[in-house]
C-alpha cells in the first residue's frame, strides 16, 4: 500500500539503485516514485554531513522485502516511494530554494526582475529542466538579476552548492503550466533523426510517448512497430532530443511511428502509467512471482498491488490453467519496460497501474459566513482541492468554498446550506482559478447528497461541517485533486505553514474576487482565541488562525473553504472556514471547524453503499 511517513535522522543501509543531487527530501521522494525500481530513499541535507560531495545526496533504493535496515544519521531524512499513492503521484515540484545554487549545463542567461519570472522562463523553454537566479543583493554586481536556465543528463542538478542570494528551482512543465503547447498527433510511417537519449521496448507508440513525456531529456520519439522489417528492432522505442528542441529532419519510413513528448501540454498531461491490456502478447522480464487468478484484469490488479511488479503476462495456455484460474506472471526489469515482447501468443499482457494518479475511489487521509483579506493571487494548480460552490436561481453566483477530499466527495461548512438545502440549485466548479472563466459551457458537478452534521444548528458556530456527495466521480488532474485529511484527533502535530484560500471578499464590505486568493496565516491556541471571543464558546472542535494585528483573514464568500497546513512536504486539511467577528480585525482571529475532530464522522459518512470505506490511509 501507500506509505507516506518520513523518517528523520535515519538512513537506509544498502539497496542502492541510483543516486543524484536534489534540493530536499520531497524532490528526492518524487524521483524515487518515478524510478522504475526505487521503493525507498534516503536524503542528506547540507547540514547533515561535512563531506561536500555527499551534501544534498539523494539515494534511491530497492529491496526484495520492501524494507531495509535503518541506521541513525543526524539530519538525514528517509522514506518510501509514493508508488501506489494515487493522486499524490506527481512530477510537479513548485518549491523555490533560497541560498542554493543548482548546477548543470547553463544554456541560457537573461536578466529578469524576480525568481518567479525566472521560473516562468524555464517553464516556457523546451530544454530547461531547472534554473538559478541571482538576487539583487548577490555579491557580484554583474550577475545580479541573472536567470540561468539549465539542464543535465539526468534532469537533476550535477551538484548543489550553498550560495547566498541565489535562488533555484525546477521547471513547472510537469505541472502542466507550460505556455509552449504540445503536438498531440502521432505521425505514421515517419522516422525522426537526431540524438537518441534512451531505447526501450514498448508494445505501441502510445506507451512510447508516455515514457518520452516523463523522461527528463526526451523531446520526441520514433517507434518501430511489430511489423518493422528488421526483427531485432521491432517494438523499439527511441527517445530523442536535439539542440533546437525539434527534429532536425524526418524520413518517410514504413512501419515507424513518431511523435512528441507531451510535457509541454498546457492544463493536461498524460498519466505516468499505461493502462491498456494487450491480447495475444507476452511481456518478458525478470520473474517476480507467479499466481493463479481469474481473468486478465485481476492479474493487472495483482501486479498493481505488488509494489515491485512493473508488468505482467496472463497465460491462457491449457497447461497454465486450472478450472477458471490461469497463471499470472508478475515481472520486472531494470528500466521498467519488458525485455522481450512476443506476439501471437495465448497470453495477454499489460503494466502495473502503481503510478496511475487516479488512484482508487477514496478520500485521502494520513495515519456566520466568513473572503481572503490581505491575500495575493493564487496560480494554476496551487490549490487543486479548492472548489467553488455556486447557486443558480435566476442568476448564478459564488456562495461558498469547499475542498475536494475524494473522487466524489467535497467537504464544506454546514452554514453554506442555511436556507438553501435544495441540491438541484447548486453547481460545484472544480479545477478553476478565475471565476470569470466560468461560462455556460464550463463543466460543473451536481450534488447527489448533502450530509449536514447531525448536531449543527442554524446560526450557531458548533459542528459547522457538511459533506457533499457528487452525482458523478471526478477525474484527478494537476488542477483538480483532493487534499489529504489529518489523522483522527490530530493534536500533537505543530503546524507552522498554514494557508487559507477562497474567492471571498477582500474587505468587510467588499465583493467576491475573480482570482482565487491565498493568505498565509498562523494558527492561534484555543486559549488565546477564547480570550478574543468572550461571548462565544471556542470548543476543542474548532481551530483559530489570525495575526494579532489583523490585516489578513478569511471573509464573506470563503466559508466552507480550506485552511490547509504543510507538514513533512504534505498538505493536510486542518480546518474549514467557519466564522469570525468581521474580517481581518485586530485581535479577532478567524474560527475554523477542526477537521481532525470529525474524522470518525467523515469516515462513517463516506462509506460506500457496499460498506467498504472510501478512505485510504497513506500511512
Amino acid at each position: 500500500g501507500c506509505l507516506t511517513q518520513l523518517y528523520e535522522n535515519a538512513f537506509f543501509r544498502g539497496g542502492d539503485v541510483a543516486s543524484m543531487y536534489t534540493p530536499n527530501a520531497q524532490y528526492c521522494q518524487m524521483r524515487c516514485t518515478f524510478h522504475p525500481r526505487c521503493l525507498l530513499f534516503s536524503f542528506l541535507p547540507a547540514s547533515s554531513i561535512n563531506d561536500m560531495e555527499k551534501r544534498f545526496g539523494c539515494f534511491l533504493k530497492d529491496s526484495v522485502t520492501g524494507t531495509l535496515p535503518k541506521v541513525h544519521r543526524t539530519g538525514a531524512v528517509s522514506g518510501h516511494s509514493l508508488k501506489q499513492c494515487g493522486h499524490q503521484i506527481s512530477a510537479c515540484h513548485r518549491d523555490i530554494y533560497k541560498g542554493v545554487d543548482m548546477r548543470g549545463v547553463n544554456f541560457n542567461v537573461s536578466k529578469v526582475s524576480s525568481v518567479e519570472e525566472c521560473q516562468k522562463r524555464c517553464t516556457s523553454n523546451i530544454r530547461c529542466q531547472f534554473f538559478s537566479y541571482a538576487t539583487q543583493t548577490f555579491h557580484k554586481a554583474e550577475y545580479r538579476n541573472n536567470c540561468l536556465l539549465k539542464y543535465s543528463p539526468g534532469g537533476t542538478p550535477t551538484a548543489i552548492k550553498v550560495l547566498s542570494n541565489v535562488e533555484s528551482g525546477f521547471s513547472l512543465k510537469p505541472c502542466a503550466l507550460s505556455e509552449i503547447g504540445c503536438h498531440m498527433n502521432i505521425f505514421q510511417h515517419l522516422a525522426f533523426s537526431d540524438v537518441d537519449v534512451a531505447r526501450v521496448l514498448t508494445p505501441d507508440a502510445f506507451v512510447c510517448r508516455t515514457i518520452c513525456t516523463y523522461h527528463p531529456n526526451c523531446l520526441f520519439f520514433t517507434f518501430y512497430t511489430n511489423v518493422w522489417k528488421i526483427e531485432s528492432q521491432r517494438n523499439v522505442c527511441l527517445l530523442k532530443t536535439s539542440e533546437s528542441g525539434t527534429p532536425s529532419s524526418s524520413t518517410p519510413q514504413e512501419n515507424t511511428i513518431s511523435g512528441y513528448s507531451l510535457l509541454t501540454c498546457k492544463r493536461t498531461l498524460p498519466e505516468p502509467c499505461h493502462s491498456k491490456i494487450y491480447p495475444g502478447v507476452d511481456f518478458g522480464g525478470e520473474e517476480l512471482n507467479v499466481t493463479f487468478v481469474k481473468g486478465v484484469n485481476v492479474c493487472q490488479e495483482t501486479c498493481t498491488k505488488m509494489i515491485r511488479c512493473q508488468f505482467f503476462t496472463y497465460s491462457l495456455l491449457p497447461e497454465d490453467c486450472k478450472e477458471e484460474k490461469c497463471k499470472c506472471f508478475l515481472r520486472l526489469s531494470m528500466d521498467g519496460s519488458p525485455t522481450r515482447i512476443a506476439y501471437g501468443t495465448q497470453g495477454s499482457s499489460g503494466y502495473s497501474l502503481r503510478l496511475c494518479n487516479t488512484g482508487d475511489n477514496s478520500v485521502c487521509t494520513t495515519k456566520t459566513s466568513t473572503r481572503i483579506v490581505g491575500g495575493t493571487n493564487s496560480s494554476w494548480g496551487e490549490w487543486p482541492w479548492q472548489v467553488s460552490l455556486q447557486v443558480k436561481l435566476t442568476a448564478q453566483r459564488h456562495l461558498c468554498g469547499g475542498s475536494l477530499i475524494g473522487h466524489q466527495w467535497v467537504l464544506t461548512a454546514a452554514h453554506c446550506f442555511d436556507g438553501l438545502p435544495l441540491q438541484d440549485v447548486w453547481r460545484i466548479y472544480s479545477g478553476i482559478l478565475n471565476l470569470s472563466d466560468i461560462t455556460k459551457d464550463t463543466p460543473f458537478s451536481q450534488i447527489k447528497e448533502i450530509i449536514i452534521h447531525q448536531n449543527y444548528k442554524v446560526s450557531e458556530g458548533n459542528h459547522d461541517i457538511a459533506l457533499i456527495k457528487l452525482q458523478a466521480p471526478l477525474n484527478y488532474t494537476e488542477f483538480q485533486k483532493p487534499i489529504c485529511l489529518p489523522s483522527k484527533g490530530d493534536t500533537s502535530t505543530i503546524y507552522t505553514n498554514c494557508w487559507v484560500t477562497g474567492w471571498g471578499f477582500s474587505k468587510e464590505k467588499g465583493e467576491i474576487q475573480n482570482i482565487l486568493q491565498k493568505v498565509n496565516i498562523p494558527l492561534v491556541t484555543n486559549e488565546e482565541c477564547q480570550k478574543r471571543y468572550q461571548d462565544y464558546k471556542i470548543t476543542q472542535r474548532m481551530v483559530c488562525a489570525g495575526y494579532k494585528e489583523g490585516g489578513k483573514d478569511a471573509c464573506k464568500g470563503d466559508s466552507g473553504g480550506p485552511l490547509v497546513c504543510k507538514h513533512n512536504g504534505m498538505w493536510r486539511l486542518v480546518g474549514i472556514t467557519s466564522w469570525g467577528e468581521g474580517c481581518a480585525r485586530r485581535e479577532q482571529p478567524g474560527v475554523y471547524t477542526k477537521v481532525a475532530e470529525y474524522m470518525d464522522w467523515i469516515l462513517e459518512k463516506t462509506q460506500s453503499s457496499d460498506g467498504k470505506a472510501q478512505m485510504q490511509s497513506p500511512a
Epitope: 510511417h189 505501441d204 511489423v227 514504413e254 493502462s275 491498456k276 495475444g280 506476439y343
Partner: antibody, heavy 122, light 107 residues
C-alpha cells in the same frame, strides 16, 4: 487512396450461413490489424471481431463467439467474416475497418468500408 | 466489459454554435478514447484518436479532451456539414465498446 469494399451480404434464414468479404487497396494490407464492426438498423455501433496482420491471432465479441470466424488473405488483400448459425439479432450493416496505426490491436479505426447489409429473417 | 455512456443523446444547435458532447467510461480508460462522426447511410469517420489527437484531414474546430473516465468532444463553431451522429469508443481493452451516440441536429 485507402479503399475498403465489403460484399457478401444479403437475406438469410435463421440458422443459415453467409461469408462476407472486404477487398482492401491503397495501403499495405499485411501491416494492419483489421476489424469487423456492425450496426443494427437505427442502432449504435458494435465491435464484432479483429485479426492481427499475420492472421495468427483473432478476437471476437461474446455475442458471436463460436459462430463467426474472421480470417484474411494477405496475398489477395482481402478480409473475411464467415458467419454461421445466424440469428435475427445478427441483422445489421457490417463494416470492415482498418486499424489507425500499423500496430497490434491498436483499437482505433481510421478507414471504414461502405458496409454490407445482412438480414436474418424467416 | 467497459460501458460507454454518451450525453446528451441529442442536441439541437445552430450554425456557429459551440457544441460539447460528453462520454463517460464505466472504469478508467486512461486516454484510450476515439470519437467518430456518422452521417445517415454512410460509414463512420474517425475524428479524434487517443482522446485529443486530431485525425489527418479533420478540421481544427473539432477537439477532444479528458482522461480516466470523463471525456469531451467539442465543436468550436458548428458548420452545416457537422450535423450528424457522434460516437465515442474505448480501446483500452477488448471487447471494444462504443457509446450510444449523440445526434446533433439543426435547431
Amino acid at each position: 487512396e485507402v479503399q475498403l469494399l465489403e460484399s457478401g451480404g444479403g437475406l438469410v434464414q435463421p440458422g443459415g450461413s453467409l461469408r462476407l468479404s472486404c477487398a482492401a487497396s491503397g495501403f499495405t494490407f499485411s501491416d494492419y490489424t483489421m476489424y469487423w464492426v456492425r450496426q443494427a438498423p437505427g442502432k449504435g455501433l458494435e465491435w464484432v471481431s479483429s485479426i492481427v496482420p499475420s492472421g495468427g491471432h483473432t478476437l471476437y465479441a461474446d455475442s458471436v463467439k463460436g459462430r463467426f470466424t474472421i480470417s484474411r488473405d494477405n496475398s489477395k488483400n482481402t478480409l473475411y467474416l464467415q458467419m454461421n448459425s445466424l440469428r435475427a439479432e445478427d441483422t445489421a450493416v457490417y463494416y470492415c475497418a482498418k486499424d489507425h496505426l500499423s500496430s497490434w490491436y491498436g483499437g482505433f479505426f481510421d478507414y471504414w468500408g461502405q458496409g454490407t447489409l445482412v438480414t436474418v429473417s424467416s | 466489459d467497459i460501458q460507454m455512456t454518451q450525453s446528451p443523446s441529442s442536441v439541437s444547435a445552430s450554425v456557429g454554435d459551440r457544441v460539447t458532447i460528453t462520454c463517460r467510461a464505466s472504469q478508467g480508460i486512461s486516454s484510450w478514447l476515439a470519437w467518430y462522426q456518422q452521417k445517415p447511410g454512410k460509414a463512420p469517420k474517425l475524428l479524434i484518436y487517443a482522446t485529443s489527437g486530431l485525425q489527418s484531414g479533420v478540421p481544427s474546430r473539432f477537439s477532444g479532451s479528458g482522461s480516466g473516465t470523463d471525456f469531451t468532444l467539442t465543436i468550436s463553431s458548428l458548420q452545416p456539414e457537422d450535423f450528424a451522429t457522434y460516437y465515442c469508443q474505448q480501446a483500452k481493452s477488448f471487447p471494444l465498446t462504443f457509446g450510444g451516440g449523440t445526434r446533433v441536429e439543426i435547431k
